[in-house]
């Protein structure tokens, strides 16, 4: 007699098997009913959910000549690379007319070897640094014991009796490799294995040993490095915009650094070069033949001033009586600073030297004393700025003032009653 | 281990030169920068000049002209002319503090040159 | 040249006491400044360079500080073997100029 044609009567004559296997394992249920008429759409159920996107194939074959006689369906759901979300209860499920029929259920379980869901990862350490690694796994079948293994050693005399899950490692002085094992009824799962690298600590107290007007020497104390020496450090420098605003832990200066390096011992550098009165940020790392420390925090520092690197230009000293009028010109060399101005020297054949501060101003009038009949006169002239005078200029003779010569009038400085300091160059 | 030792030092009469050699071990001279100080009897230090790692020296201005400053790889020279009694010191050698042209930390224990009539 | 006068040319302290010495220079040498302690009969030792660091070896005791012409140098807890002369040094613009040595009496 045809089947399904009564409310009461399951269409199905098959039903879906049992799979258990481990992870990976492809496997297919299939169920098989017989109907007459048109055939229904089989759909199947995962604990009573239908699924949607099954991987499933539907067969049917008639058993007489007309529409209406008998089919055979066969619904066949595949199952590729079983997984812990494919477990449960399968059923298969029809509509035929009013009337809802669902299988006998077959069920899909998971038992084997341990799963990783998270593994140690490689990872760059400082020497002597505490980090944790992560490894965590599952059945079923249940439960799963890890074993921590450094170097392929274990880490605990047997598994679940260690560190599980996380695995606290308070430093290391060496590069070293870490995997960690699952254990459970079915046997061992190994995870990869994460190589940590031992690089070296961040260089500690980077600070400045000298600081003159185009150079700064600087020092810092190495961090650890475990047993890989440092084969060199590396310093940059970067010149501090007002705007720039390098913070501690800003990662990048806004321009392209001045990098040097550094062999080691000792740990200092000697930075040439710079200019003078000017800001600097400078920071260090130190590298192992396993690699390089991170970088130390930018460190602001400064030049200082210098002297004028070279003489006031085009002196020329002219004479009238008792008055001589001289005037220069801003040295054309570097002034390594602010120029606070310039000071004067004069002297006679038979005379001691006098020595003036002339301020800013780029030219004198000297009252000379007596009846201007002192022979030889010459004058010097250097700039100065905060850090010093800077050289003076080669003795300019006076020459006697010719009448028709512009002598514009300006403020008189009386010679001092006293003569200050002599120069080594009279 | 590193070590600075002066020789050289002895009695000598005016006018006489003098040369005094500073011997370094385990010092590379072409990292440190190396100094000469002086210190006359029950008096203060003194700078003389400096021999920078490229062989560049610097000189204190009274120093200039009559004392002078050479090195081979493992000697650092003060060759010293025209003595006079006021040139009676111990004279001191010393390295560069790590790369320092300026700060000085590995000191030897001097020679003493007397210039006596 | 840069002058480096300092204070006082001797002090006298008990164990324990702080002893402060002064340097001054004729003009700014932006921290440009060391101390050597020496000993008699012995060469001169680093004790603080670029006004306030202190090399490996020297005890924390040993304190130096200041900025452009004034620097100072201050030793706490004296102890016996601080018995010694006492030398600022400038080594600004390339020139170095000691100070005059300040002798310490430990009592």
């Known amino acids: 007699a045809p089947r399904g044609t009564q409310a009461e009567e399951s269409p199905f004559v098959g039903n879906p098997g049992n799979i258990t296997g481990a992870r990976g394992l492809t496997g297919t249920l299939r169920c098989q009913l017989q109907v007459q008429g048109e055939p229904p759409e089989v759909h199947w159920l995962r604990d009573g959910q239908i699924l949607e996107l099954a991987d499933s194939t539907q067969t049917q074959v008639p058993l007489g000549e007309d529409e209406q006689d008998d089919w055979i369906v066969v619904s066949q759901l595949r199952i590729t690379s079983l997984q812990l979300s494919d477990t449960g209860q399968y059923q298969c499920l029809v509509f035929l007319g009013h009337q809802t029929f669902v299988s006998q259920p077959g069920y899909v379980g998971l038992e084997g070897l341990p799963y990783f869901l998270e593994e140690p990862e490689d990872r760059t350490v400082a020497a002597n640094t505490p980090f944790n690694l992560s490894c965590q796994a599952q059945g079923p079948p249940e439960p799963v014991d890890l074993l921590w293994l450094q170097d392929a050693v274990p880490l605990a005399t047997a598994p679940g009796h260690g560190p599980q899950r996380s695995l606290h490692v308070p430093g290391l002085n060496k590069t070293s490799s870490f995997s960690c094992e699952a254990h459970n009824a079915k046997g061992v799962t190994t995870s990869r294995t994460a190589t940590i690298t031992v690089l070296p600590q961040q260089p500690r107290n980077l600070h400045l040993v000298s600081r003159q007007p185009t150079e700064l020497e600087v020092a810092w104390t190495p961090g650890l490095s475990g047993i890989y020496p440092l084969t060199h450090c590396t310093l940059q420098a970067v010149l501090s915009d007002d705007g720039m605003g390098i913070q501690a832990g800003e990662p990048d200066p806004p321009e392209e650094p001045l990098t040097s390096q550094a062999s080691v011992p000792p740990h200092q550098l000697r930075l040439g070069s710079l200019h003078p009165h000017t800001p600097y940020h400078i920071r260090v790392a130190c590298t192992s033949s396993q690699g390089p420390s991170s970088w130390t925090h930018w460190l602001p520092v400064e030049t200082p001033e210098g002297v004028p690197l070279g003489p006031p230009e085009n002196i020329s000293a002219t004479r009238n009586g008792s008055q001589a009028f001289v005037h220069w010109q801003e040295p054309r060399a570097p002034l390594q600073g602010t120029l606070l101005g310039y000071r004067l020297a004069y002297q006679g054949q038979d005379t001691p030297e006098v020595l003036m501060d002339i301020g800013l101003r780029q030219e004198v009038t000297l009252e000379l004393q007596g009846d201007g009949s002192v022979s030889n006169l010459t004058v010097c002239v250097a700039a100065y700025t905060a850090a010093g005078d800077g050289p003076w200029s080669l003795p300019v003779p006076l020459e006697a003032w010719r009448p028709g010569q512009a002598q514009p009038v300006h403020q008189l400085v009386k010679e001092p009653s006293t003569p200050a300091f002599s120069w080594p160059w009279w | 281990c590193q070590s600075v030792e002066e020789s050289g030092g002895r009695l000598v009469t005016p006018g006489t030169p003098l040369t005094l050699t500073c011997t370094v071990s385990g010092i590379d001279l072409s990292t440190y920068a190396m100094i000469w100080v002086r210190q006359a009897p029950g008096e203060g230090l003194e700078w003389i000049g400096t021999i920078y790692t490229d062989g560049a020296t610097a000189y204190a201005r009274w120093a200039k002209g009559r004392f002078t400053i050479s090195k081979t790889s493992t000697t650092v020279d003060l060759k010293m002319t025209s003595l006079t009694t006021e040139d009676t010191a111990t004279y001191f050698c010393?390295?560069?503090?790590?790369?320092?042209?300026?700060?000085?930390?590995?000191w030897g224990p001097g020679t003493l040159v007397t210039v006596s009539l | 040249d840069i002058v480096m006068t300092q204070t006082p040319a001797s002090v006298e302290a008990a164990v324990g006491d702080t002893v402060t010495i002064k340097c001054q220079a004729s003009?700014?040498?932006?921290?440009?400044l060391a101390w050597y302690q020496q000993k008699p009969g012995q060469p001169p030792k680093l004790l603080i360079y670029?006004?306030?660091n202190l090399p490996s070896g020297v005890p924390s005791r040993f304190k130096g500080s200041g900025s452009g012409t004034e620097y100072t140098l201050t030793i706490s807890g004296v102890q016996c073997d601080d018995a010694a002369t006492y030398y600022c040094?400038?080594?600004?613009?390339?020139?170095?100029?000691f100070g005059g040595g300040t002798e310490v009496v430990v009592k």
């Open positions: 040094q400038n080594y600004y613009i390339n020139e170095i100029v």
């Open positions: 670029f006004a306030s």
């Open positions: 003009q700014n040498i932006y921290s440009n």
């Open positions: 010393a390295r560069g503090f790590g790369i320092s042209k300026f700060v000085f930390s590995l």
